[in-house]
């Protein structure tokens, strides 16, 4: 099949890192610097991505693969293949159109990116607040208030072990 294909299309013999030059009797010409072809049989090379400004190069372009970018310190990647860089904020903040703003009371953000999220409502699970929330940390829910009534133990004692061969009475 490969031999048949190459008889039909001479370009199929051109390896990655080259392009098939229609204007030169379909000669395989190397991709120029700062361009690449990641598969064989290509009629063009792709221009390499350039990591400029807030982007920095994570992986250099080669004749067979594109460059990969990430973001300079103080920024983080967004989008497929790090198509955008977004400013970091501190924990306890979120990025708004006016810059980094502290989380409102009742919300938190434990990362340098993303939005402030509401504290967990422990009572929805029938639990109580064990540790209060902050701008940087969610609340920690503890046992339900009923479990903490005087004389009640929050630790369940182990069930007595049965002896083998005895059925329950």
């Amino acid at each position: 099949f490969e031999r048949t294909r190459s008889l039909q299309d001479p370009c199929s013999n051109c390896p990655a890192g080259t392009f098939c030059d229609n204007n030169r009797n379909q000669i395989c010409s190397p991709c120029p610097p700062n361009s690449f072809s990641s598969a064989g049989g290509q009629r063009t090379c792709d221009i390499c991505r350039q990591c400029k400004g807030v982007f920095r190069t994570r992986k250099e372009c080669s004749s067979t693969s594109n460059a990969e970018c990430d973001c300079t310190p103080g920024f983080h990647c967004l989008g497929a293949g790090c198509s955008m860089c977004e400013q970091d904020c501190k924990q306890g903040q979120e990025l708004t159109k006016k810059g980094c703003k502290d989380c409102c009371f009742g919300t938190f953000n434990d990362q340098k990116r993303g939005i402030c999220r509401p504290w967990t409502n422990c009572s929805l699970d029938g639990k109580s607040v064990l540790v209060n929330g902050t701008k940087e940390r969610d609340v920690v829910c503890g046992p339900s208030p009923a479990d903490l009534s005087p004389g009640a133990s929050s630790v369940t004692p182990p069930a007595p072990a049965r002896e083998p061969g005895h059925s329950p009475q």
Partner: nanobody, 120 residues
Amino acid sequence: EVQLVESGGGLVQPGGSLRLSCAASGRTFDNYAVGWFRQAPGKEREYVGTYWSGYAHYGDFEKGRFTISRDNAKNTVYLQMNNLRPEDTAVYYCAISLKYPMATVTPDYQGQGTQVTVSS
């Protein structure tokens, strides 16, 4: 919005020379291959050549008469045309693409074109 503006066209006698310019506004040429195409009245668009990263690729009609170069400082690409013939009469378009060469490619952006007429 990217705008490509061609200039330098005009009337020239056979055997003469012209240098066409292509200037980009709204974006630099830094990360694009730059190509030239031409279209004569009643004919299909024809590939002239592509420039990228110090390398130029040309269509098979010009046989060394045309040269593409680039001035990064001026953000301009040039098409030097020597020994012009009547059959070179056409509208010449500048275009940019993320592909090299642009012989088989639909460009990402293309200018409005500049008329070149070769006649005695």
